[in-house]
Interface confidence: medium
């Protein structure tokens, strides 16, 4: 059995920032889970991770240089991305894995959200010299 994920088809980020909400057909309350956001049609870049454990504080991090924060709802995770570059306009996919309690669950691949960055032309960091290619 797979978790279903709903995302907006497109979000426009005028000021290099955007809130992307991932809505799940599953209640995350009192669950240990790992929600992540991935860039590109091939999901090659893991943009941001939200790790939730019923006994600990929410952990939000990016290992790929994105400035991100996360907010947890009962059946959603919202990723707040800041300092996006125009050349990071791409399609972004929500992913969810529930580790506890058993059984392990993950999601059907979602339709993705095109994030259209229309803000200031910031200079990308060395981590992101250009867009990902499928």
């Amino acid at each position: 059995n797979k978790i279903l994920v709903k995302q907006s088809p497109m979000l426009v980020a005028y000021d290099n920032a955007v809130n992307l909400s991932c809505k799940y057909s599953y209640n995350l309350f009192s669950r240990e889970f790992r929600a992540s956001l991935h860039k590109g049609l091939d999901s090659a870049v893991e943009v941001c991770v939200v790790y939730g454990n019923y006994s600990q504080q929410l952990q939000v991090y990016s290992k790929t240089g994105f400035n991100c924060d996360g907010k947890l709802g009962n059946e959603s995770v919202t990723f707040y991305l800041q300092n996006l570059y125009v050349n990071q306009t791409d399609i972004y996919f929500c992913k969810i894995e529930v580790m506890y309690p058993p059984p392990y669950l993950d999601n059907e691949k979602s339709n993705g959200t095109i994030i259209h960055v229309k803000g200031k032309h910031l200079c990308p960091s060395p981590l992101f010299p250009g867009p990902s290619k499928p």
Epitope: M10, H116, S132
Partner: antibody, heavy 125, light 107 residues
Framework: EVQLVESGGGLVQPGGSLRLSCAAS????????MSWFRQAPGKGLEWVSV???????YYADSVKGRFTISRHNSKNTLYLQMNSLRSEDTAVYYC???????????????????WGQGTTVTVSS | EIVLTQSPATLSLSPGERATLSCRAS??????LAWYQQKPGQAPRLLIY???NRATGIPARFSGSGSGTDFTLTISSLEPEDFAVYYC?????????FGQGTKVEIK
């Protein structure tokens, strides 16, 4: 006036190459999402490729590895480089602009709002 | 990929009559469906986006409805210039896909 004008079509042998051009006026190609579509004789429309404003490019499975979409910012022109052409690539090719606007956090996508007149590609020996 | 099936393939009507065109998706596309008009030798023209919103400059006789898997384009009173082929297109799932078209011809 906002418009797109395609060129570069013609007759080519199977296995050959062509480069289609799509010159834009009245708006900036590089700040828009631009796609190529095609329409085989007597058939419906098929999406071929897209280039996002950020430069990311994607392709239909039927052309992946053979076609390359690109743009020249100062010439305000979109291109489609077509290699290893097959008879099933015979079609009228259109470039089109994705109509997108909105405010922070909102998406407003309203379909392909500007189309070129089309250029005919015939692949035959 | 999502398959869009349009019906009927051909619609034979007279000017002034009402035209009802159908587009059915193989799975839900929510409201992310557009309609285009194409005349012979011309590029497509956007009529309706997001199922029910008229594009700029499109006359009020064109209207769209539906959500999920079933959509309808209605032309309330056909004008001579409305005889053309109409395509639906979804943007809910990758890749974007079109229906095979409905030809509206003069009876």
């Amino acid at each position: 006036e906002v418009q797109l004008v395609e060129s570069g079509g013609g007759l080519v042998q199977p296995g050959g190459s062509l480069r289609l051009s799509c010159a834009a006026s009245g708006f900036t190609v590089s700040s828009n999402f631009m796609s190529w579509f095609r329409q085989a004789p007597g058939k419906g429309l098929e999406w071929v490729s897209v280039i996002y404003s950020g430069g990311s490019t994607y392709y239909a499975d039927s052309v992946k590895g053979r076609f390359t979409i690109s743009r020249h910012n100062s010439k305000n022109t979109l291109y489609l480089q077509m290699n290893s052409l097959r008879s099933e690539d015979t079609a009228v090719y259109y470039c089109a602009r994705h109509g997108i606007t909105g405010t922070t956090g909102d998406y407003y996508y309203y379909g392909m709002d500007v189309w070129g007149q089309g250029t005919t590609v015939t692949v035959s020996s | 990929e999502i398959v869009l099936t349009q019906s009927p393939a051909t619609l034979s009507l007279s000017p002034g009559e009402r035209a009802t065109l159908s587009c059915r998706a193989s799975q839900s596309v929510r409201s992310y469906l557009a309609w285009y008009q194409q005349k012979p030798g011309q590029a497509p023209r956007l009529l309706i986006y997001d199922a029910s919103n008229r594009a700029t400059g499109i006359p009020a006789r064109f209207s769209g409805s539906g959500s999920g898997t079933d959509f309808t384009l209605t032309i309330s009173s056909l004008e001579p210039e409305d005889f053309a082929v109409y395509y639906c297109q979804q943007r809910s799932n990758w890749p974007p896909t079109f229906g095979q078209g409905t030809k509206v011809e003069i009876k």
